[in-house]
């Protein structure tokens, strides 16, 4: 990895061992200076593998609300608007980091947690399982 | 929102104002107890809107490595394996939280940051703009 010289103005840290506890400023900085401002807002409906978004809420997590995609069909929508079962709709998943209150119900103490979320769906050619 | 009683065993916190600084344990807990264990590993190639994954590395960010999807084509792959430009490949984007070292180069002090990443691509019917 790349070694970066430590800034002498860093806050003091007692324990250098893992599991390490760090200070995090929750005042979120939004870096979404996206060159393509159009977001995936209507793709869920226009996709050949359409999906619905479900709200997943957990007050012990930060962010407390996460939207989960569920593919509408096992097949994909063809040019006629019908479901074509020769193709498969599959979820596109991503591991994301969230903060989990630890100990529970604590407003200022968290643990980093990795969760798998489904962001949308895509249409794929099926895997053909050949029987010997 | 849901109000949860504060746990009396919480670490003490000086400043209750935003921007609030919290303690975060970086020993990641992995909650991926997924009922559908098959992950999106080969979907990027099998999709009718295939994509390539590009490594985005930033040592001032946690996680330092993020993979970004870029759609291979403007159109979608049809049943013959050719690109059909009557359909559009579009990126599915998601806002995720990362930790940004602040002040820079500090190992134990971060600020929460929201970034937009492309996770994969999906094939959509184009929006037809009618000229008046």
């Amino acid at each position: 990895g790349i070694t970066i010289p430590r800034n002498p103005g860093c806050p003091n840290s007692e324990d250098k061992n893992f599991p390490r506890t760090v200070m995090v400023n929750l005042n979120i900085h939004n870096r979404n200076t996206n060159t393509n401002p159009k977001r995936s807002s209507d793709y869920y409906n226009r996709s050949t593998s359409p999906w619905n978004l479900h709200r997943n809420e957990d007050p012990e997590r930060y962010p407390s609300v996460i939207w989960e995609a569920k593919c509408r069909h096992l097949g994909c929508i063809n040019a006629d608007g019908n479901v074509d079962y020769h193709m498969n709709s599959v979820p596109i998943q991503q591991e994301i980091l969230v903060l989990r209150r630890e100990p529970p119900h604590c407003p200022n103490s968290f643990r980093l947690e990795k969760i798998l979320v489904s962001v949308g769906c895509t249409c794929v050619t099926p895997i053909v399982h050949h029987v010997a | 929102g849901i109000t949860i009683p504060r746990n009396p065993g919480c670490p003490n916190s000086e400043d209750k104002n935003f921007p609030r600084t919290v303690m975060v344990n970086l020993n990641i807990h992995n909650r991926n107890t997924n009922t559908n264990p098959k992950r999106s590993s080969d979907y990027y190639n099998r999709s009718t809107s295939p994509w390539n994954l590009h490594r985005n590395e930033d040592p001032e960010r946690y996680p330092s490595v993020i993979w970004e999807a870029k759609c291979r084509h403007l159109g979608c792959i049809n049943a013959d394996g050719n690109v059909d430009y009557h359909m559009n490949s579009v990126p599915i984007q998601q806002e995720i939280l990362v930790l940004r070292r602040e002040p820079p180069h500090c190992p134990n002090s971060f600020r929460l940051e929201k970034i937009l990443v492309s996770v994969g691509c999906t094939c959509v019917t184009p929006i037809v703009h009618h000229v008046a």
């Epitope: 409906n45 619905n52 978004l53 479900h54 709200r55 997943n56 989960e68 995609a69 569920k70 593919c71 509408r72 069909h73 096992l74 097949g75 479901v83 079962y85 498969n88 709709s89 599959v90 979820p91 998943q93 798998l116 489904s118 769906c121 794929v124 099926p126 895997i127 053909v128 399982h129 | 107890t33 997924n34 009922t35 559908n36 098959k38």
Partner: antibody
Framework: QVQLQESGPGLVKPSETLSLTCTVS????????VSWIRQPPGKGLEWIGI???????DYNSAFKSRVTISVDTSKNQFSLKLSSVTAADTAVYYC??????????????????WGQGTLVTVSS | DIVMTQSPLSLPVTPGEPASISCKSS????????????LAWYLQKPGQSPQLLIY???TRQSGVPDRFSGSGSGTDFTLKISRVEAEDVGVYYC?????????FGQGTKVEIK
């Protein structure tokens, strides 16, 4: 607990529109999808269509041209409208909640809670 | 549309004895991406609405007694009751949730001998 209750006129004249309401309680509308199913007297079950949590719909193509399913979230109510009815539409009509499974990334089309059903007779 | 064919259509049973119902689909219900079979079983007791017993061929819905079990793959499926009880009488339906429209079998009436 989860409850679904169908209501509407028990008698509809041929060529008219059958209108039913399904009032639900005990679960969150934004999470769950609801299907309508019917059962002609002495016969089996027939899926009519579904309304997803976002208000989108999918219908059995056998009914597509004459069916509409909608939701009024403020009243916790779903509705079914079936136009141009004939005697063949005489049936017990059920609304049912589609099973929601966390950490499973497809909509489900099996139903884990059903209303008690309402009999609709089409006759002049 | 996918045709679901159940047999037998009528099944007289003796309490304490096993019972078995067959369901055949006109197309495979196995989804290659997750190896799940999209078949569910319901029981409609006399005068009641259907209740979900089993989904994904063999997963019992919560609260369903373990005397009920499901098996099969592709196009051939079976519901077994290891020891029939009086409360198990009614009409059993299989349903495929793979292809739209989502279709049911014609039902198997289970009654006490």
């Amino acid at each position: 607990q989860v409850q679904l209750q169908e209501s509407g006129p028990g008698l509809v004249k041929p060529s008219e529109t059958l209108s039913l309401t399904c009032t639900v309680s005990g679960f969150s509308l934004p999470s769950h999808s609801v299907s309508w199913i019917r059962q002609p007297p002495g016969k089996g079950l027939e899926w009519i269509g579904i309304i997803w949590n976002n208000g989108g719909t999918d219908y059995n193509s056998a009914f597509k041209s004459r069916v509409t399913i909608s939701v009024d979230t403020s009243k916790n109510q779903f509705s079914l409208k079936l136009s141009s009815v004939t005697a063949a539409d005489t049936a017990v009509y059920y609304c049912a909640r589609n099973f929601y499974i966390t950490d499973y990334y497809y909509e489900n089309y099996f139903m884990d809670a059903w209303g008690q059903g309402t009999l609709v007779t089409v006759s002049s | 549309d996918i045709v679901m064919t159940q047999s037998p259509l009528s099944l007289p049973v003796t309490p304490g004895e096993p019972a078995s119902i067959s369901c055949k689909s006109s197309q495979s219900l196995l989804f290659s991406e997750n190896q799940k079979n999209y078949l569910a079983w319901y029981l409609q007791k006399p005068g009641q609405s259907p209740q979900l017993l089993i989904y994904w061929t063999s997963t019992r819905q919560s609260g369903v007694p373990d005397r009920f079990s499901g098996s099969g793959s592709g196009t051939d499926f079976t519901l077994k009751i290891s020891r029939v009880e009086a409360e198990d009488v009614g009409v059993y339906y299989c349903q495929q949730s793979y292809y739209t429209p989502y279709t049911f079998g014609q039902g198997t009436k289970v009654e006490i001998k």
